[in-house]
């Protein structure tokens, strides 16, 4: 049924879906705080621009009785139930901020004629790529894939003189939502990553992973996994690792590596950590004071979603354009706006761009050090440490296949 949008005559509403099933186990109260903090900023910005309008958020909660797994497994139905709720109430805002689970976002996008923009803090999977009215404010799997392929191919750095074409991927099914979709993308046989690699095998059992670490007949020296250092330790423990093994630990939403007093444990010496460049400190903001580093990114994405809406609203109002049009719905891409923590860039498909950082453990200082950065917007690598103090032989990353000489 046709749902009227509360989105004109100087009053603009944001529909925020507060789903029990979420990409990160974040209390909904914290997300509300983030949204409200965003609203305050948007109101201030609009006022400064001489636009005397009202901007509010309506929080739409699901009943939580049926869909209570807390993770994303039952999110598909919860998302559709919330849309039904909106439809029944005949009330929809100018924009929908909400589903963070890939399942729910995909289904909601499929099952509705979206003439309004959808902003997601999550929806990491490849199935949410290239959606015309969907904007994603946390790095999706496609961006990770492009980095990995770029890094695999690189062979002209002082510390990486071999291009790689092989990899193991560890994926045991217990991953967090972001990791699940990142690894899912690497596993998919039709994905860019799989297409560019000559050999790729998924390890699903702990024992498989543990055996590879010292297996002389292994087909690759490189293992990709996703999670934090503790996750790796549970799996690897203090087991011996062959000297030319490289573990790539994808841990994008974790600022802990950059904290001053952090020392890398010994088991991280064969590991390169891929994370996101930390923004300016969010610790002093009211919404993030009680959040863990990972959850800061999630709450920040909600806040930035509000700021993005404010940015677009301001542009359309200043140009005298209608908000309830397909043009508005399709406009949330290929732009840079002022986020809570600095400029935020969205690519042509509405996905956030960021600076990924590859860290290594210095054998001298036992600290995490930046090896290189990667700008997802231009798909370019920037070497930072030209002579890293690696654990690997000659302080160079080994070849991905043992015994294969220079190419």
């Amino acid at each position: 049924s046709q749902v009227s949008q509360n989105c004109h005559n100087g009053s603009y509403e944001i529909s925020v879906l507060m789903m029990g099933n979420s990409a990160f186990a974040e209390p909904l109260k914290n997300l509300e705080d983030a949204v409200n903090e965003g609203l305050e900023i948007v109101r201030g910005r609009l006022q400064n621009a001489g636009l005397n309008v009202t901007v509010n958020a309506t929080f739409m909660y699901s009943d939580g009785l049926i869909h209570n797994s807390g993770d994303c497994r039952s999110s598909t139905c919860e998302g559709l139930d919330l849309l039904r709720k909106i439809s029944n109430a005949q009330r929809m805002g100018c924009v929908l901020i909400g589903p963070s689970c890939t399942y729910s976002t995909f289904q909601m996008y499929l099952d509705t004629e979206l003439s309004y923009p959808m902003i997601s803090a999550g929806s990491f999977g490849l199935s949410c790529d290239y959606k015309e009215t969907l904007t994603r404010l946390m790095s999706p799997a496609r961006k990770l894939m492009y980095f990995l392929v770029n890094f695999w191919k690189t062979n002209d750095l002082p510390f990486k003189t071999y291009s790689w074409s092989t990899s193991y991927v560890y994926k045991n099914g217990t991953e967090t939502e972001d990791c699940f979709w990142y690894l899912n993308a690497l596993e998919a046989s039709v994905s860019y990553f799989s297409h560019e690699l000559g050999f790729k095998v998924v390890l699903r059992q702990d024992k498989e992973f543990q055996d590879i670490l010292m297996d002389h007949n292994r087909k690759s020296n490189v293992i990709i996994m996703c999670g934090g250092p503790e996750f790796l330790y549970k799996l690897k423990g203090d087991r011996a690792v062959a000297e030319d093994i490289v573990i790539i630990l994808v841990d994008l939403f974790n600022d802990q590596y950059f904290e001053d007093n952090v020392t890398a444990p010994d088991y991280m010496k064969n590991v390169l950590v891929l994370t996101l460049s930390p923004g300016n400190s969010l610790l002093n903001s009211s919404f993030s004071r009680n959040l863990s580093p990972t959850k800061r990114d999630f709450a920040l994405a909600y806040l930035n979603g509000i700021l993005l809406f404010g940015h677009m609203l301001k542009i359309f109002l200043e140009n005298g354009e209608n908000i309830t049009t397909p043009k508005f719905a399709h406009a949330f891409r290929n732009l840079t706006f002022e986020g809570y923590d600095g400029p935020v860039t969205l690519d042509d498909w509405g996905d956030v761009d960021s600076t990924m950082v590859l860290l290594y453990t210095s054998v001298d200082t036992k600290k995490y050090k930046v090896l290189l950065t990667y700008d997802t917007h231009v798909n370019k690598t920037y070497p930072v440490d030209m002579s890293p103090t690696f654990t690997w032989k000659n302080s160079k990353l080994p070849n991905d296949i043992t015994g294969r000489g220079p190419q």
Partner: antibody, heavy 120, light 112 residues
């Protein structure tokens, strides 16, 4: 306009050290990597090493490992190249050269060169 | 390291006539991204080098269109369609396909 201005000519005794400076202007100092390239009289160009002004990390050509040190001073946008244990074969013109990395190294701008003569 | 070999060592040319310099690499310069990282530099007498061509055939700004680069894999050529007096000097090829970058030995272009 990008400019790389190098220090003046030097005459050195064998066994001593020389430190050549290269002052950058006209761009953000940390946005280009700095290469050092030398050219002995009547010879070709020889790549010596590179420094990342952003963090000060370096990588040197095998031939110069242990003898060359590249440093930078961000407050003055200056890069330095010090070569120790000089011998007569080190007599050459030394160039600093700014470049970028984009899946392949480039050398975009060159200093005017510093002549170092090693003679007893 | 990749070895770059240039020929000829010396190239005497007549003003207004074409000139061609060859550069050969010890292995393919095609990078994994599909690009070929081969640069050409010009060094006039008493001056610093300057880049003329990057990625085989792309001319730098300010470089006259009489200069052109071509080639693929391991064989590359710098052509000057009509040599002028200001073209006298030494020309170097340089690869940046893998670490470390290396230069060719140079070709001296002089007027007959």
């Amino acid at each position: 306009e990008v400019q790389l201005v190098q220090s003046g000519a030097e005459v050195k005794r064998p066994g001593s050290s020389v430190k050549v400076s290269c002052k950058a202007s006209g761009y953000t100092f940390t946005s280009y990597y700095m290469h050092w390239v030398r050219q002995a009289p009547g010879q070709g160009l020889e790549w010596m090493g590179i420094i990342n002004p952003s963090g000060g990390s370096t990588s040197y050509a095998q031939k110069f490992q242990g003898r060359v040190t590249m440093t930078r001073d961000t407050s003055t946008s200056t890069v330095y190249m010090e070569l120790s244990s000089l011998r007569s074969e080190d007599t050459a013109v030394y160039y600093c050269a700014a470049g970028t990395y984009s899946s392949g190294w480039t050398i975009d701008y060159w200093g005017q060169g510093t002549t170092v003569t090693v003679s007893s | 390291d990749i070895v770059m070999t240039q020929s000829p060592l010396s190239l005497p040319v007549t003003l207004g006539q074409p000139a061609s310099i060859s550069c050969r690499s010890s292995q393919s310069l095609v990078y994994t991204d599909g690009n070929t990282y081969l640069n050409w530099f010009q060094q006039r007498p008493g001056q610093s080098p300057r880049r003329l061509i990057y990625k085989v055939s792309n001319r730098d700004s300010g470089v006259p269109d009489r200069f052109s680069g071509s080639g693929s894999g391991t064989d590359f050529t710098l052509k000057i369609s009509r040599v002028e007096a200001e073209d006298v000097g030494i020309y170097y090829c340089m690869h940046s396909k893998q670490w470390p970058p290396t230069f060719g030995g140079g070709t001296k272009v002089e007027i007959k």
